[in-house]
């Protein structure tokens, strides 16, 4: 399981952290799947995009997401790291002008059309593991991650004080 303990202690002030550059330091086009190998897909319905978590049929093409990586500085009084207190934040865009957004009131993940500069709700702190396993923590709500709930993406609170099985917040990135 993916260890998240200690996350909240150092991310309480995420909303105060600053993106150090307007341009991403790198971008990466990848398909997104759950830890259990279900695909994250995006469908245009009634002029808005819906997000699905589903098993794809054999040879069915996976949807791609553009991950844009930004550097963000910890608030210096919070981290004690000085110039070295960097985090990676990502935005996720499955199609032009649309980005994943955290809706903290509804505990949901939505696709919104918007212009740059993107709102804070579109930024997620990247927690990454070996072999392209990642999780996405809301910039606007520390300790809350994109996760899978009832075959949909949702926002899930990770309580670092408990030894939770957190596979539902783990995602795999792949080029295929």
């Amino acid at each position: 399981a993916f260890g998240i303990s200690g996350v909240q202690k150092y991310t309480r002030a995420l909303h105060d952290s600053s993106i150090t550059g307007i341009s991403p330091i790198t971008e990466y086009l990848a398909s997104l799947s759950t830890y259990n190998d279900q695909s994250i897909t995006f469908a245009l319905e009634d002029e808005s995009y819906e997000i699905y978590v589903e098993d794809l049929k054999k040879d069915e093409k996976k949807d791609k997401v553009l991950l844009s990586y930004y550097e963000s500085q910890h608030p210096s009084n919070e981290s004690g790291d000085g110039v070295d207190g960097k985090m990676l934040m990502v935005t996720l865009s499955p199609t032009k002008d649309f980005w994943l957004h955290a809706n903290n009131k509804e505990h949901s993940v939505e696709l919104h059309k918007c212009e740059k500069p993107l709102p804070d709700q579109a930024f997620f702190v990247l927690h990454n593991m070996h072999s392209n396993c990642v999780s996405f923590e809301c910039k606007t709500d520390p300790g809350v991650f994109i996760g899978v709930k009832d075959n949909h993406l949702a926002l899930i609170k990770v309580d670092s004080s408990e030894n939770l099985c957190t596979e539902n917040i783990l995602f795999k990135l792949s080029e295929t």
């Epitope: 399981a1 993916f2 260890g3 998240i4 303990s5 200690g6 996350v7 202690k9 150092y10 330091i25 790198t26 990466y28 990848a30 990586y69 550097e71 910890h74 981290s79 004690g80 790291d81 000085g82 070295d84 207190g85 960097k86 985090m87 990676l88 702190v125 990247l126 927690h127 990454n128 593991m129 070996h130 072999s131 392209n132 080029e175």
Partner: antibody, heavy 121, light 106 residues
């Protein structure tokens, strides 16, 4: 200022054990992945082992799996490498390094000065 | 496992030269590549991360480029203090170093 200080190296006979320590300062240790990288005399760099920020996930070079164990004590800002069943090919300078970003296994931003391990009879 | 191949293994150049070092990955590494510098008797030092981002405190004569499997470190005007061995390093899948390029003065 970020500092990483490795200790515990020395001369050891094949088959014996050694434990390396790396004490970190100048950054919030519990936020960062930590690594051990080695360099045999006159050779290139070789990644050996990694541990994530809370110690729950560890990774090893195939040739050291089952013999080496990486661990960390976040309260003491220290990462360890327990090396058992040492072989002559483990002879190298062992460097401790920290991750470049909080919570991320991407990149190594700082390295210690290294500690030399010599395995010889 | 991803293999990283650096070329040339040794490079001789003169002060002021524009120097290019190459690193090739066995698979696409999506720009997840760093360059570090190691001087004799010293620990390695990070120069470039994520292919083209200059680490804090590193002179601007160093730059990186590339994508997919092919990556380059360029020193725009070689200085005597740049004599060192340069390693590329990927972290797209696991962690792997290239064999290094030793840069010497002519």
């Amino acid at each position: 200022e970020v500092q990483l200080v490795e200790t515990g190296g020395g001369l050891v006979q094949p088959g014996r054990s050694l434990k390396l320590s790396c004490v970190a300062s100048g950054f919030t240790f519990s936020n960062y992945w930590m690594y051990w990288i080695r360099q045999a005399p006159g050779m290139g760099l070789e990644w050996v082992s990694s541990i994530n920020n809370d110690g729950g996930n560890t990774y090893y070079l195939d040739s050291v799996k089952g013999r080496f164990t990486i661990s960390r004590n976040n309260a003491e800002n220290t990462v360890y490498l327990q090396m058992n069943s040492l072989r002559s090919e483990d002879t190298a300078t062992y460097y401790c390094a920290k991750g470049h970003y909080s919570y991320s296994s991407y990149s190594f931003s700082y390295w210690g000065q290294g500690t030399l391990v010599t395995v010889s009879s | 496992d991803i293999q990283m191949t650096q070329s040339p293994s040794v490079l001789s150049a003169s002060v002021g030269d524009r120097v290019t070092l190459s690193c090739k990955a066995s698979h696409n590494i999506n720009k997840h590549l760093d360059w570090c510098q190691q001087k004799v008797g010293e620990a390695p030092k990070l120069l470039i991360y994520f292919t083209n981002n200059l680490q804090t405190g590193i002179p601007s004569r160093f730059s990186g480029s590339g994508s997919g499997t092919d990556y380059t470190l360029t020193i725009s005007s070689l200085q005597p203090e740049d004599v060192a061995t340069y390693f590329c390093f990927q972290y797209n899948s696991g962690w792997t170093f290239g064999g290094g390029t030793k840069l010497e003065l002519k």
